[in-house]
């Protein structure tokens, strides 16, 4: 697994270096998570032909994965910093149950899956410190999440492989959109 931000040897060897700003730390954290997702996607694609699945087939799912929309204020047109930040944090909180689902889905990248999950928790904490309007952030219901997790784990193996692929793809897209938006803040 790649070394989490702030723990690489360069940081240790250069204590006189300027500490990272809040925005730089968030940027670095997201890029670290994206690297982890790439490694997980590699294993998924090597294991099965899921990565050749058509967009149409992937669209026919009943997963409610977070997705950026125009109204969220994260795109260049109609950009709204506060609305967008709330959307990013809410979306990441909603992704947490899916990241929990991924934990038993990898054979050779088990640590990588755990690293993505833990780094996302840290990212949420960073962003919550940045947000002014924490009351607008809705936290998913734990009971609903527990039953969703049970349902996902009960699926047949093919569906679980497809679900894994879709979660990774959607999470990557969400983080990339978040990264672009946060760089405008």
């Amino acid at each position: 697994a790649p070394v989490p931000p702030g723990e690489d040897s360069k940081d240790v060897a250069a204590p006189h270096r300027q500490p990272l700003t809040s925005s730089e730390r968030i940027d670095k954290q997201i890029r670290y998570i994206l690297d982890g997702i790439s490694a997980l996607r590699k294993e998924t694609c090597n294991k099965s032909n899921m990565c050749e699945s058509s967009k149409e087939a992937l669209a026919e799912n009943n997963l409610n994965l977070p997705k950026m929309a125009e109204k969220d204020g994260c795109f260049q047109s109609g950009f709204n910093e506060e609305t967008c930040l709330v959307k990013i944090i809410t979306g990441l909180l909603e992704f947490e149950v899916y990241l929990e689902y991924l934990q038993n889905r990898f054979e050779s990248s088990e640590e990588q899956a755990r690293a993505v999950q833990m780094s996302t928790k840290v990212l949420i904490q960073f962003l919550q410190k940045k947000a002014k309007n924490l009351d607008a952030i809705t936290t998913p219901d734990p009971t609903t999440n527990a039953s969703l997790l049970t349902k996902l784990q009960a699926q047949n193996q093919w569906l679980q492989d497809m679900t894994t692929h879709l979660i990774l793809r959607s999470f990557k897209e969400f983080l990339q959109s978040s990264l672009r938006a946060l760089r405008q803040m």
Epitope: S53, E56, A57, L58, E60, N61, N62, E107, K151, A154, Q155, N156, Q157, W158, L159, M162
Partner: antibody, heavy 119, light 111 residues
Framework: EVQLQQSGPELVKPGASVKMSCKAS????????MHWVKQKPGQGLEWIGY????????KYNEKFKGKATLTSDKSSSTAYMELSSLTSEDSAVYYC????????????WGQGTSVTVSS | DIVLTQSPASLAVSLGQRATISCRAS??????????MNWFQQKPGQPPKLLIY???NQGSGVPARFRGRGRGTRFRLNIHPMEEDDSAMYFC?????????FGGGTKLEIK
């Protein structure tokens, strides 16, 4: 050709245990989940549970927890089911069935193992 | 658990005619464009024989007169034209998730 060969019929006494086997051939044993299904004489079918031979992960129907134990042996490509504390209610035919994969691979069933519990 | 309701419980059809068996699921058995509904034929003393898998794909060696259709929660097995050898029990089964569940069965006879 995918084949599942199940062990022969069993006549056992109440309170005893029985262990049946399901030998797989024609595919990579560790790549597919193996399910077990019960059918009592003249009745419908009931799912017992499954084992993933890759990591020996199991999932059971609540009703069969404590009754059935699923194991597998990679070296012989064989799945096993042990039934304990047998009663007349356990008299049935038991099938192993390999799970398919999407629309590419269909499920495949064994011929069944008949278990009769009688004193 | 997904409950499968099969109808009718029994059916008598003349040779050469059409037999239609229905199966309704308590929730959708679809996922990523595939319907995980299977149909089995079972004769006395024999194991279930897979006729149709993922709603409409024919099992190996299954005659073309056996046709499956449907998606979501409603599925049908059609047998046409009915032949002597088709007299048996028929079951639907969902393999979308565990526990696998089965319909109550339809006893098909020659009229």
């Amino acid at each position: 050709e995918v084949q599942l060969q199940q062990s022969g019929p069993e006549l056992v006494k109440p309170g005893a245990s029985v262990k049946m086997s399901c030998k797989a051939s024609g595919y990579t044993f560790t790549s597919y989940v193996m399910h077990w299904v019960k059918q009592k004489p003249g009745q419908g079918l009931e799912w017992i549970g499954y084992i993933n031979p890759y990591n020996d992960g199991t999932k059971y129907n609540e009703k069969f927890k404590g009754k059935a134990t699923l194991t597998s042996d990679k070296s012989s490509s064989t799945a096993y089911m042990e039934l304990s504390s047998l009663t007349s209610e356990d008299s049935a035919v038991y099938y192993c069935a390999r799970e398919g994969y999407g629309n590419l691979e269909r499920d495949c069933w064994g011929q069944g193992t008949s278990v009769t519990v009688s004193s | 658990d997904i409950v499968l309701t099969q109808s009718p419980a029994s059916l008598a059809v003349s040779l050469g005619q059409r037999a239609t068996i229905s199966c309704r699921a308590s929730e959708s058995v679809d996922g990523f464009g595939i319907s995980f509904m299977n149909w089995f034929q079972q004769k006395p003393g024999q194991p279930p024989k897979l006729l149709i898998y993922v709603a409409s794909n024919q099992g190996s060696g299954v005659p073309a007169r056996f046709r499956g259709r449907g998606r979501g929660t409603r599925f049908r097995l059609n047998i046409h034209p009915m032949e002597e050898d088709d007299s048996a029990m028929y079951f639907c089964q969902q393999s979308k998730e565990v526990p696998w569940t089965f319909g109550g069965g339809t006893k098909l006879e020659i009229k």
